[in-house]
Protein backbone atom coordinates (compact mmCIF):
# COMPACT_ATOMS: atom_id res chain seq x y z
CA UNK A 1 0.00 0.00 0.00
CA UNK A 2 1.19 3.55 -0.17
CA UNK A 3 0.21 6.89 0.95
CA UNK A 4 1.41 9.98 -0.55
CA UNK A 5 5.10 9.86 -1.70
CA UNK A 6 5.71 7.19 1.02
CA UNK A 7 6.26 3.72 -0.61
CA UNK A 8 5.32 0.73 1.56
CA UNK A 9 6.83 -2.64 0.94
CA UNK A 10 4.81 -5.55 0.56
CA UNK A 11 2.63 -6.83 4.12
CA UNK A 12 3.11 -3.06 5.62
CA UNK A 13 0.31 -1.12 6.39
CA UNK A 14 0.21 2.53 5.79
CA UNK A 15 -0.25 4.82 8.90
CA UNK A 16 -1.14 8.52 8.72
CA UNK A 17 0.65 9.58 12.07
CA UNK A 18 1.33 13.52 13.14
CA UNK A 19 4.44 13.87 11.62
CA UNK A 20 3.15 12.39 8.25
CA UNK A 21 2.75 9.08 6.92
CA UNK A 22 4.68 5.47 8.12
CA UNK A 23 5.09 2.38 7.24
CA UNK A 24 4.51 0.05 10.13
CA UNK A 25 4.15 -3.66 9.88
CA UNK A 26 1.22 -5.56 11.86
CA UNK A 27 2.97 -8.76 11.83
CA UNK A 28 6.66 -8.96 10.93
CA UNK A 29 6.18 -12.57 9.65
CA UNK A 30 4.59 -11.39 6.73
CA UNK A 31 6.76 -8.44 6.16
CA UNK A 32 10.72 -8.76 4.85
CA UNK A 33 12.74 -9.22 7.70
CA UNK A 34 14.99 -6.41 8.09
CA UNK A 35 17.58 -9.31 9.35
CA UNK A 36 17.37 -11.29 6.73
CA UNK A 37 20.97 -9.06 5.76
CA UNK A 38 22.55 -9.74 8.71
CA UNK A 39 23.05 -5.80 9.48
CA UNK A 40 24.56 -6.59 12.89
CA UNK A 41 28.16 -6.02 12.94
CA UNK A 42 30.74 -8.06 15.02
CA UNK A 43 28.82 -10.55 16.82
CA UNK A 44 25.47 -8.62 17.48
CA UNK A 45 22.30 -10.43 17.38
CA UNK A 46 19.72 -9.37 15.37
CA UNK A 47 15.97 -8.43 16.64
CA UNK A 48 12.73 -8.46 13.65
CA UNK A 49 10.68 -4.81 14.10
CA UNK A 50 7.43 -3.82 13.15
CA UNK A 51 9.14 -0.25 12.26
CA UNK A 52 11.40 0.82 9.73
CA UNK A 53 14.43 -0.41 9.99
CA UNK A 54 12.49 -3.70 10.64
CA UNK A 55 15.41 -5.02 13.25
CA UNK A 56 17.33 -3.77 16.31
CA UNK A 57 20.68 -5.08 17.18
CA UNK A 58 21.52 -6.36 20.78
CA UNK A 59 25.16 -5.36 20.69
CA UNK A 60 28.12 -7.18 22.36
CA UNK A 61 30.51 -5.11 24.19
CA UNK A 62 32.70 -3.08 23.31
CA UNK A 63 30.35 -2.12 20.38
CA UNK A 64 27.29 -0.35 19.95
CA UNK A 65 25.27 1.99 17.40
CA UNK A 66 22.64 0.80 15.46
CA UNK A 67 24.43 -1.85 13.88
CA UNK A 68 27.14 -2.61 16.56
CA UNK A 69 29.26 -0.51 14.19
CA UNK A 70 31.10 1.61 16.73
CA UNK A 71 33.64 0.57 18.93
CA UNK A 72 33.73 2.24 22.52
CA UNK A 73 36.86 1.91 24.72
CA UNK A 74 36.02 0.67 27.94
CA UNK A 75 36.96 3.50 30.32
CA UNK A 76 38.30 1.63 32.73
CA UNK A 77 41.25 0.02 30.56
CA UNK A 78 44.46 1.69 30.98
CA UNK A 79 46.58 1.70 27.84
CA UNK A 80 48.68 -1.43 27.89
CA UNK A 81 52.51 -1.26 28.85
CA UNK A 82 55.31 -3.49 28.67
CA UNK A 83 56.39 -3.37 32.11
CA UNK A 84 58.57 -6.34 31.96
CA UNK A 85 62.77 -5.50 32.47
CA UNK A 86 63.21 -9.07 30.64
CA UNK A 87 61.30 -7.84 27.62
CA UNK A 88 63.60 -4.74 28.20
CA UNK A 89 66.62 -6.74 27.97
CA UNK A 90 65.89 -8.83 25.18
CA UNK A 91 64.54 -6.67 22.57
CA UNK A 92 66.51 -6.16 19.49
CA UNK A 93 68.59 -8.92 19.89
CA UNK A 94 67.40 -10.57 16.61
CA UNK A 95 65.45 -13.43 18.48
CA UNK A 96 61.73 -13.29 19.00
CA UNK A 97 60.80 -13.82 22.41
CA UNK A 98 56.79 -14.50 22.38
CA UNK A 99 56.59 -13.58 26.07
CA UNK A 100 57.12 -9.72 24.63
CA UNK A 101 55.84 -10.37 21.03
CA UNK A 102 53.37 -7.75 21.80
CA UNK A 103 51.87 -4.39 20.97
CA UNK A 104 52.93 -2.80 24.00
CA UNK A 105 56.44 -3.99 23.43
CA UNK A 106 56.75 -3.52 20.13
CA UNK A 107 56.85 -7.03 19.03
CA UNK A 108 60.00 -7.97 21.18
CA UNK A 109 61.29 -4.39 19.34
CA UNK A 110 60.94 -5.19 16.45
CA UNK A 111 62.66 -8.59 16.50
CA UNK A 112 59.26 -10.34 16.31
CA UNK A 113 58.16 -7.94 13.07
CA UNK A 114 60.81 -7.68 10.66
CA UNK A 115 62.31 -5.13 12.42
CA UNK A 116 59.45 -3.56 11.69
CA UNK A 117 57.85 -1.51 15.36
CA UNK A 118 54.36 -0.93 14.42
CA UNK A 119 53.15 -2.52 11.28
CA UNK A 120 49.46 -1.00 12.43
CA UNK A 121 51.37 2.34 12.56
CA UNK A 122 48.81 4.01 10.05
CA UNK A 123 45.56 2.50 10.95
CA UNK A 124 43.19 4.58 12.11
CA UNK A 125 40.50 2.06 13.15
CA UNK A 126 38.66 2.54 16.65
CA UNK A 127 39.81 -0.99 17.43
CA UNK A 128 43.00 -2.55 18.07
CA UNK A 129 43.15 -4.14 14.61
CA UNK A 130 46.35 -6.58 15.60
CA UNK A 131 44.19 -8.07 18.23
CA UNK A 132 41.44 -8.93 15.89
CA UNK A 133 43.22 -11.34 14.24
CA UNK A 134 40.74 -13.85 14.72
CA UNK A 135 39.64 -15.67 11.90
CA UNK A 136 36.88 -13.40 11.71
CA UNK A 137 35.72 -10.99 9.79
CA UNK A 138 36.16 -7.24 11.97
CA UNK A 139 35.42 -4.75 9.29
CA UNK A 140 36.50 -1.39 10.93
CA UNK A 141 39.94 -3.36 10.35
CA UNK A 142 39.08 -4.19 6.61
CA UNK A 143 41.08 -1.33 5.35
CA UNK A 144 44.32 -1.06 3.52
CA UNK A 145 45.96 0.84 6.23
CA UNK A 146 44.29 -1.76 8.48
CA UNK A 147 46.17 -4.89 6.84
CA UNK A 148 42.63 -6.26 5.46
CA UNK A 149 41.94 -7.39 8.59
CA UNK A 150 44.59 -9.91 8.05
CA UNK A 151 42.27 -10.92 4.87
CA UNK A 152 39.46 -11.96 7.07
CA UNK A 153 36.97 -10.49 5.66
CA UNK A 154 37.21 -12.39 1.78
CA UNK A 155 37.14 -16.06 2.61
CA UNK A 156 40.62 -16.65 3.95
CA UNK A 157 39.85 -20.11 4.71
CA UNK A 158 39.93 -20.93 0.97
CA UNK A 159 42.62 -22.90 0.07
CA UNK A 160 44.56 -24.29 -3.35
CA UNK A 161 42.63 -27.67 -4.33
CA UNK A 162 45.55 -28.54 -6.49
CA UNK A 163 48.42 -27.23 -4.30
CA UNK A 164 51.17 -29.29 -5.06
CA UNK A 165 50.92 -29.19 -8.58
CA UNK A 166 49.79 -25.72 -8.74
CA UNK A 167 53.55 -25.16 -7.11
CA UNK A 168 55.15 -27.24 -9.07
CA UNK A 169 53.31 -25.56 -12.08
CA UNK A 170 53.47 -21.37 -10.64
CA UNK A 171 55.22 -18.92 -13.31
CA UNK A 172 56.50 -21.99 -15.67
CA UNK A 173 55.01 -20.24 -18.76
CA UNK A 174 52.41 -22.16 -19.61
CA UNK A 175 48.73 -21.43 -18.53
CA UNK A 176 47.25 -24.44 -16.20
CA UNK A 177 43.57 -23.19 -16.05
CA UNK A 178 42.79 -25.18 -12.37
CA UNK A 179 45.85 -22.95 -10.94
CA UNK A 180 44.29 -19.95 -12.70
CA UNK A 181 42.37 -18.39 -9.10
CA UNK A 182 43.75 -16.20 -6.04
CA UNK A 183 43.99 -18.51 -3.36
CA UNK A 184 46.47 -20.83 -6.29
CA UNK A 185 48.20 -17.73 -6.87
CA UNK A 186 47.06 -17.22 -10.38
CA UNK A 187 49.66 -19.21 -11.99
CA UNK A 188 51.83 -16.75 -11.20
CA UNK A 189 50.37 -14.83 -13.92
CA UNK A 190 50.75 -17.26 -16.44
CA UNK A 191 47.17 -17.27 -17.89
CA UNK A 192 47.61 -13.22 -18.12
CA UNK A 193 51.01 -12.69 -20.13
CA UNK A 194 48.86 -11.04 -22.96
CA UNK A 195 47.39 -8.64 -19.80
CA UNK A 196 49.17 -5.49 -19.73
CA UNK A 197 50.99 -5.05 -15.83
CA UNK A 198 49.90 -2.87 -13.01
CA UNK A 199 52.39 -2.44 -10.47
CA UNK A 200 51.96 -0.99 -7.18
CA UNK A 201 54.00 1.82 -6.47
CA UNK A 202 57.45 1.18 -4.32
CA UNK A 203 59.47 -1.58 -3.77
CA UNK A 204 59.27 -4.58 -1.32
CA UNK A 205 63.10 -4.94 -0.19
CA UNK A 206 63.48 -8.20 1.84
CA UNK A 207 66.56 -9.67 3.92
CA UNK A 208 66.20 -13.38 3.68
CA UNK A 209 69.05 -16.21 5.57
CA UNK A 210 69.87 -17.73 1.90
CA UNK A 211 72.45 -17.17 -0.34
CA UNK A 212 71.55 -15.75 -3.59
CA UNK A 213 71.75 -18.96 -5.37
CA UNK A 214 69.66 -20.38 -3.36
CA UNK A 215 66.81 -17.75 -3.20
CA UNK A 216 67.31 -17.65 -7.10
CA UNK A 217 66.70 -21.54 -7.34
CA UNK A 218 63.86 -21.57 -5.05
CA UNK A 219 62.30 -18.18 -6.43
CA UNK A 220 59.40 -19.32 -7.76
CA UNK A 221 58.71 -21.17 -4.47
CA UNK A 222 59.77 -17.81 -2.31
CA UNK A 223 57.32 -15.51 -4.56
CA UNK A 224 54.63 -17.53 -4.48
CA UNK A 225 54.95 -17.88 -0.87
CA UNK A 226 55.12 -14.38 -0.21
CA UNK A 227 52.49 -13.61 -3.16
CA UNK A 228 49.82 -16.40 -1.02
CA UNK A 229 50.31 -14.48 1.93
CA UNK A 230 49.41 -10.87 0.09
CA UNK A 231 46.95 -12.35 -2.16
CA UNK A 232 48.77 -10.93 -5.17
CA UNK A 233 51.52 -11.84 -7.42
CA UNK A 234 55.09 -10.52 -6.97
CA UNK A 235 58.69 -10.67 -9.02
CA UNK A 236 62.03 -10.00 -8.52
CA UNK A 237 62.93 -6.18 -9.76
CA UNK A 238 65.37 -6.05 -12.51
CA UNK A 239 68.35 -3.13 -12.32
CA UNK A 240 68.82 -0.53 -15.46
CA UNK A 241 71.05 -4.18 -16.96
CA UNK A 242 68.11 -5.96 -16.77
CA UNK A 243 69.54 -8.13 -14.02
CA UNK A 244 67.66 -9.67 -11.01
CA UNK A 245 68.01 -7.26 -8.13
CA UNK A 246 69.10 -10.44 -5.87
CA UNK A 247 72.19 -9.35 -3.61
CA UNK A 248 74.94 -10.87 -1.44
CA UNK A 249 73.88 -9.94 2.48
CA UNK A 250 76.44 -9.59 4.86
CA UNK A 251 74.50 -9.21 7.87
CA UNK A 252 73.62 -6.05 10.03
CA UNK A 253 76.01 -5.03 13.01
CA UNK A 254 73.24 -5.53 15.84
CA UNK A 255 74.86 -5.30 19.17
CA UNK A 256 74.55 -8.83 19.56
CA UNK A 257 76.93 -9.48 16.42
CA UNK A 258 79.22 -6.67 17.80
CA UNK A 259 79.83 -8.95 20.95
CA UNK A 260 79.83 -12.44 19.65
CA UNK A 261 82.73 -11.29 17.10
CA UNK A 262 84.77 -9.76 20.63
CA UNK A 263 84.50 -13.20 21.96
CA UNK A 264 84.93 -15.43 18.86
CA UNK A 265 88.70 -14.92 18.14
CA UNK A 266 89.30 -15.01 14.35
CA UNK A 267 91.31 -17.83 13.00
CA UNK A 268 94.47 -16.51 10.23
CA UNK A 269 92.29 -16.59 6.70
CA UNK A 270 89.12 -16.24 7.95
CA UNK A 271 86.98 -14.23 5.68
CA UNK A 272 86.05 -11.47 7.01
CA UNK A 273 82.93 -11.02 5.73
CA UNK A 274 80.68 -13.75 5.53
CA UNK A 275 77.38 -13.97 3.29
CA UNK A 276 74.51 -14.12 5.73
CA UNK A 277 71.70 -14.44 3.24
CA UNK A 278 70.65 -12.04 0.02
CA UNK A 279 68.65 -9.13 0.11
CA UNK A 280 66.19 -8.91 -2.49
CA UNK A 281 64.22 -6.06 -4.38
CA UNK A 282 60.15 -6.99 -4.75
CA UNK A 283 57.61 -5.51 -6.93
CA UNK A 284 53.97 -6.42 -6.88
CA UNK A 285 52.56 -6.91 -9.95
CA UNK A 286 48.06 -6.11 -9.40
CA UNK A 287 47.05 -7.50 -12.91
CA UNK A 288 45.16 -9.95 -11.77
CA UNK A 289 44.39 -9.05 -8.05
CA UNK A 290 42.51 -6.39 -9.61
CA UNK A 291 40.09 -8.40 -11.52
CA UNK A 292 39.28 -10.47 -8.62
CA UNK A 293 39.30 -8.09 -6.06
CA UNK A 294 39.15 -4.62 -3.99
CA UNK A 295 42.02 -5.79 -1.63
CA UNK A 296 44.73 -5.12 -3.49
CA UNK A 297 48.15 -2.99 -2.65
CA UNK A 298 48.67 0.10 -4.40
CA UNK A 299 51.84 0.78 -3.07
CA UNK A 300 54.45 -1.90 -1.10
CA UNK A 301 53.94 0.24 2.42
CA UNK A 302 51.11 -1.88 3.55
CA UNK A 303 52.46 -4.86 2.32
CA UNK A 304 55.41 -4.65 4.09
CA UNK A 305 53.39 -4.14 6.97
CA UNK A 306 51.28 -7.39 6.74
CA UNK A 307 54.12 -9.50 6.08
CA UNK A 308 55.56 -8.17 9.67
CA UNK A 309 52.24 -9.07 10.46
CA UNK A 310 52.42 -12.80 9.57
CA UNK A 311 56.10 -12.29 11.51
CA UNK A 312 54.89 -11.54 14.36
CA UNK A 313 52.10 -14.58 13.82
CA UNK A 314 54.86 -16.91 13.28
CA UNK A 315 53.15 -17.94 9.54
CA UNK A 316 56.24 -16.82 7.58
CA UNK A 317 57.56 -19.86 5.50
CA UNK A 318 60.83 -18.29 4.62
CA UNK A 319 63.61 -17.32 7.01
CA UNK A 320 63.27 -13.59 6.76
CA UNK A 321 64.68 -11.05 8.71
CA UNK A 322 63.56 -7.91 7.98
CA UNK A 323 61.14 -5.74 5.49
CA UNK A 324 60.98 -2.24 3.79
CA UNK A 325 58.91 -0.79 1.58
CA UNK A 326 61.24 1.40 -0.81
CA UNK A 327 59.33 4.35 -2.85
CA UNK A 328 62.19 5.18 -4.96
CA UNK A 329 64.81 2.30 -5.14
CA UNK A 330 68.31 3.30 -5.71
CA UNK A 331 69.63 1.13 -8.40
CA UNK A 332 71.49 -1.18 -5.32
CA UNK A 333 71.64 -0.83 -1.89
CA UNK A 334 73.68 -2.55 0.59
CA UNK B 1 68.89 -34.98 5.97
CA UNK B 2 69.12 -32.34 8.85
CA UNK B 3 71.76 -34.08 11.39
CA UNK B 4 73.32 -32.61 14.05
CA UNK B 5 76.40 -34.79 16.15
CA UNK B 6 78.03 -33.58 19.58
CA UNK B 7 81.28 -34.21 19.97
CA UNK B 8 84.05 -32.61 23.02
CA UNK B 9 82.44 -34.77 25.85
CA UNK B 10 84.92 -36.63 28.46
CA UNK B 11 85.91 -36.78 31.95
CA UNK B 12 87.19 -33.10 33.86
CA UNK B 13 87.81 -32.50 37.65
CA UNK B 14 85.70 -30.01 39.25
CA UNK B 15 86.97 -26.59 38.61
CA UNK B 16 87.95 -27.79 34.81
CA UNK B 17 87.30 -26.86 31.16
CA UNK B 18 85.82 -28.53 28.64
CA UNK B 19 84.42 -27.21 24.96
CA UNK B 20 81.82 -28.99 23.40
CA UNK B 21 81.22 -29.40 19.80
CA UNK B 22 77.67 -29.51 17.32
CA UNK B 23 78.04 -30.30 13.97
CA UNK B 24 75.04 -29.16 11.93
CA UNK B 25 73.71 -30.18 8.17
CA UNK B 26 71.50 -30.30 5.54
CA UNK B 27 69.94 -26.85 6.70
CA UNK B 28 70.95 -23.21 6.73
CA UNK B 29 72.69 -23.02 9.94
CA UNK B 30 72.40 -19.29 10.39
CA UNK B 31 68.25 -19.22 9.61
CA UNK B 32 67.54 -21.36 13.24
CA UNK B 33 68.33 -21.35 16.45
CA UNK B 34 70.13 -23.88 18.36
CA UNK B 35 69.75 -24.93 22.21
CA UNK B 36 72.34 -27.14 24.30
CA UNK B 37 70.03 -29.43 26.20
CA UNK B 38 71.47 -31.65 29.46
CA UNK B 39 70.23 -34.77 30.96
CA UNK B 40 71.80 -35.58 34.53
CA UNK B 41 71.96 -39.67 34.71
CA UNK B 42 68.62 -40.88 35.63
CA UNK B 43 66.95 -37.11 35.74
CA UNK B 44 64.99 -35.60 33.46
CA UNK B 45 66.10 -32.61 30.92
CA UNK B 46 67.18 -29.43 31.62
CA UNK B 47 67.50 -26.45 29.06
CA UNK B 48 71.05 -24.82 29.44
CA UNK B 49 71.88 -22.17 26.78
CA UNK B 50 70.49 -21.03 23.32
CA UNK B 51 71.86 -19.10 20.33
CA UNK B 52 70.35 -17.39 17.09
CA UNK B 53 73.75 -17.39 15.13
CA UNK B 54 72.89 -15.09 12.34
CA UNK B 55 72.46 -12.21 15.02
CA UNK B 56 74.71 -13.86 17.94
CA UNK B 57 71.87 -13.24 20.74
CA UNK B 58 72.72 -15.58 23.67
CA UNK B 59 70.30 -16.66 26.57
CA UNK B 60 71.46 -18.70 29.45
CA UNK B 61 69.81 -20.64 32.81
CA UNK B 62 70.36 -19.51 35.97
CA UNK B 63 72.45 -22.28 36.64
CA UNK B 64 75.08 -22.16 33.84
CA UNK B 65 75.42 -17.90 33.99
CA UNK B 66 79.11 -16.66 33.96
CA UNK B 67 80.25 -19.97 33.88
CA UNK B 68 78.74 -21.35 30.55
CA UNK B 69 79.67 -19.93 26.82
CA UNK B 70 77.90 -20.64 23.51
CA UNK B 71 79.06 -19.58 20.54
CA UNK B 72 78.54 -20.30 17.08
CA UNK B 73 80.66 -20.44 13.79
CA UNK B 74 78.50 -19.96 10.56
CA UNK B 75 81.09 -20.56 8.12
CA UNK B 76 81.66 -24.29 9.56
CA UNK B 77 78.17 -24.70 10.12
CA UNK B 78 79.53 -25.17 14.24
CA UNK B 79 77.80 -24.44 17.53
CA UNK B 80 80.06 -24.35 21.07
CA UNK B 81 79.03 -24.88 24.40
CA UNK B 82 82.47 -23.52 26.30
CA UNK B 83 82.12 -24.89 29.93
CA UNK B 84 84.27 -23.75 32.59
CA UNK B 85 84.31 -23.85 36.49
CA UNK B 86 82.82 -27.00 36.17
CA UNK B 87 81.06 -28.91 39.12
CA UNK B 88 80.03 -32.17 40.01
CA UNK B 89 76.26 -31.21 38.81
CA UNK B 90 77.41 -30.32 35.82
CA UNK B 91 77.95 -34.40 34.86
CA UNK B 92 75.04 -35.15 31.99
CA UNK B 93 74.25 -35.86 29.26
CA UNK B 94 74.50 -32.71 27.08
CA UNK B 95 72.54 -32.64 23.90
CA UNK B 96 72.40 -30.03 21.22
CA UNK B 97 69.04 -29.11 19.62
CA UNK B 98 67.32 -26.83 16.86
CA UNK B 99 64.86 -24.20 17.23
CA UNK B 100 62.46 -24.97 14.86
CA UNK B 101 61.23 -21.01 14.29
CA UNK B 102 63.98 -19.11 12.88
CA UNK B 103 64.92 -16.76 15.01
CA UNK B 104 62.22 -17.49 17.31
CA UNK B 105 63.51 -19.03 21.10
CA UNK B 106 59.76 -19.53 21.54
CA UNK B 107 59.54 -22.65 19.11
CA UNK B 108 60.08 -26.04 19.69
CA UNK B 109 63.30 -28.18 19.13
CA UNK B 110 62.25 -30.65 16.28
CA UNK B 111 66.06 -31.72 15.76
CA UNK B 112 68.31 -33.57 18.42
CA UNK B 113 72.02 -35.10 18.53
CA UNK B 114 72.51 -38.18 19.74
CA UNK B 115 74.36 -36.36 22.85
CA UNK B 116 78.16 -36.23 24.47
CA UNK B 117 78.64 -37.50 28.05
CA UNK B 118 80.25 -34.92 30.35
CA UNK B 119 81.59 -36.16 33.60
CA UNK B 120 83.04 -34.11 36.19
CA UNK B 121 84.89 -35.87 39.28
CA UNK B 122 87.93 -35.96 41.14
CA UNK C 1 60.68 -19.19 35.92
CA UNK C 2 57.76 -21.21 34.92
CA UNK C 3 57.52 -24.64 36.85
CA UNK C 4 55.92 -27.40 34.65
CA UNK C 5 54.65 -30.47 36.50
CA UNK C 6 53.76 -33.74 35.09
CA UNK C 7 51.46 -36.11 36.21
CA UNK C 8 51.38 -38.82 37.03
CA UNK C 9 55.51 -39.48 37.19
CA UNK C 10 55.08 -43.32 36.12
CA UNK C 11 52.51 -45.24 35.16
CA UNK C 12 52.51 -49.04 33.72
CA UNK C 13 49.74 -49.76 30.83
CA UNK C 14 49.06 -52.48 28.51
CA UNK C 15 49.44 -52.38 24.91
CA UNK C 16 45.74 -51.30 23.35
CA UNK C 17 45.35 -48.79 26.64
CA UNK C 18 44.35 -45.43 26.23
CA UNK C 19 47.13 -43.29 27.63
CA UNK C 20 46.67 -39.78 29.35
CA UNK C 21 49.42 -37.38 30.42
CA UNK C 22 48.62 -34.48 32.15
CA UNK C 23 51.34 -31.06 32.62
CA UNK C 24 50.78 -28.52 34.08
CA UNK C 25 52.75 -24.50 33.98
CA UNK C 26 52.97 -22.37 37.16
CA UNK C 27 51.60 -19.32 34.94
CA UNK C 28 50.00 -19.14 31.45
CA UNK C 29 52.25 -20.45 28.45
CA UNK C 30 49.33 -19.68 26.37
CA UNK C 31 49.81 -22.71 23.81
CA UNK C 32 53.61 -22.88 23.15
CA UNK C 33 53.98 -25.88 24.52
CA UNK C 34 55.71 -28.82 23.44
CA UNK C 35 55.84 -32.61 23.90
CA UNK C 36 58.85 -35.13 23.66
CA UNK C 37 59.27 -38.63 24.15
CA UNK C 38 63.01 -40.48 25.15
CA UNK C 39 63.78 -43.74 24.92
CA UNK C 40 66.92 -45.05 27.22
CA UNK C 41 69.89 -44.19 25.88
CA UNK C 42 68.72 -41.92 23.22
CA UNK C 43 67.85 -38.21 22.78
CA UNK C 44 64.54 -37.37 22.88
CA UNK C 45 61.97 -36.85 20.09
CA UNK C 46 59.98 -34.06 19.12
CA UNK C 47 56.09 -35.32 19.32
CA UNK C 48 53.92 -32.24 19.82
CA UNK C 49 54.22 -28.67 19.90
CA UNK C 50 51.82 -25.33 19.74
CA UNK C 51 49.99 -28.34 22.32
CA UNK C 52 48.06 -29.73 19.69
CA UNK C 53 50.15 -29.75 16.13
CA UNK C 54 51.78 -33.37 15.71
CA UNK C 55 55.18 -33.21 14.23
CA UNK C 56 56.08 -34.47 10.99
CA UNK C 57 56.29 -38.19 11.09
CA UNK C 58 54.15 -38.21 14.44
CA UNK C 59 51.62 -41.45 14.36
CA UNK C 60 47.53 -40.23 14.55
CA UNK C 61 47.28 -42.19 18.21
CA UNK C 62 49.29 -39.65 19.60
CA UNK C 63 47.49 -35.90 20.52
CA UNK C 64 47.89 -33.31 22.66
CA UNK C 65 45.11 -30.31 23.81
CA UNK C 66 45.02 -27.54 26.48
CA UNK C 67 46.36 -23.91 26.81
CA UNK C 68 47.27 -21.50 29.28
CA UNK C 69 48.57 -23.97 31.97
CA UNK C 70 46.52 -26.89 31.84
CA UNK C 71 48.20 -29.20 29.40
CA UNK C 72 47.01 -33.14 27.91
CA UNK C 73 48.88 -35.63 26.01
CA UNK C 74 46.89 -39.06 24.75
CA UNK C 75 47.75 -41.91 23.41
CA UNK C 76 44.63 -43.11 22.47
CA UNK C 77 45.95 -46.93 21.78
CA UNK C 78 49.81 -47.90 23.29
CA UNK C 79 51.71 -49.50 21.02
CA UNK C 80 54.41 -51.65 22.26
CA UNK C 81 56.93 -48.97 20.79
CA UNK C 82 55.09 -45.97 22.87
CA UNK C 83 57.21 -47.39 26.12
CA UNK C 84 59.25 -44.38 27.28
CA UNK C 85 59.52 -41.61 29.16
CA UNK C 86 57.16 -38.22 28.15
CA UNK C 87 58.25 -34.72 28.54
CA UNK C 88 56.33 -31.12 28.23
CA UNK C 89 58.45 -28.25 28.11
CA UNK C 90 57.13 -24.42 27.94
CA UNK C 91 58.98 -22.63 25.27
CA UNK C 92 56.81 -19.22 25.77
CA UNK C 93 59.84 -17.43 28.08
CA UNK C 94 63.45 -18.16 28.39
CA UNK C 95 64.45 -19.86 30.80
CA UNK C 96 63.08 -22.44 28.65
CA UNK C 97 61.45 -25.44 31.41
CA UNK C 98 60.57 -28.95 31.11
CA UNK C 99 58.37 -30.98 33.17
CA UNK C 100 60.27 -33.82 35.42
CA UNK C 101 58.80 -36.84 32.87
CA UNK C 102 56.42 -39.31 33.04
CA UNK C 103 57.73 -42.87 32.47
CA UNK C 104 55.18 -45.21 30.36
CA UNK C 105 55.90 -48.99 31.59
CA UNK C 106 54.21 -52.41 30.58
CA UNK C 107 52.18 -53.88 32.79
Known amino acids: SSCGQVKCRKGEQCVHTASGPRCFCPSPRDCESGCASSPCQHGGSCHPQRQPPYYSCQCAPPFSGSRCELYTAPPSTPPATCLSQYCADKARDGVCDEACNSHACQWDGGDCSLTMENPWANCSSPLPCWDYINNQCDELCNTVECLFDNFECQGNSKTCKYDKYCADHFKDNHCDQGCNSEECGWDGLDCAADQPENLAEGTLVIVVLMPPEQLLQDARSFLRALGTLLHTNLRIKRDSQGELMVYPYYGEKSAAMKKQRMTRRSLPGEQEQEVAGSKVFLEIDNRQCVQDSDHCFKNTDAAAALLASHAIQGTLSYPLVSVVSESLTPERTQ | EVQLVESGGGLVQPGGSLRLSCAASGYTFSSYGMSWVRQAPGKGLEWVSYIYPYSGATYYADSVKGRFTISADTSKNTAYLQMNSLRAEDTAVYYCARHSGYYRISSAMDVWGQGTLVTVSA | DIQMTQSPSSLSASVGDRVTITCRAS??????LAWYQQKPGKAPKLLIYGASSRASGVPSRFSGSGSGTDFTLTISSLQPEDFATYYC?????????FGQGTKVEIK
Open chain 3, 27 to 32: QSNRRF
Open chain 3, 89 to 97: QQYYISPLT
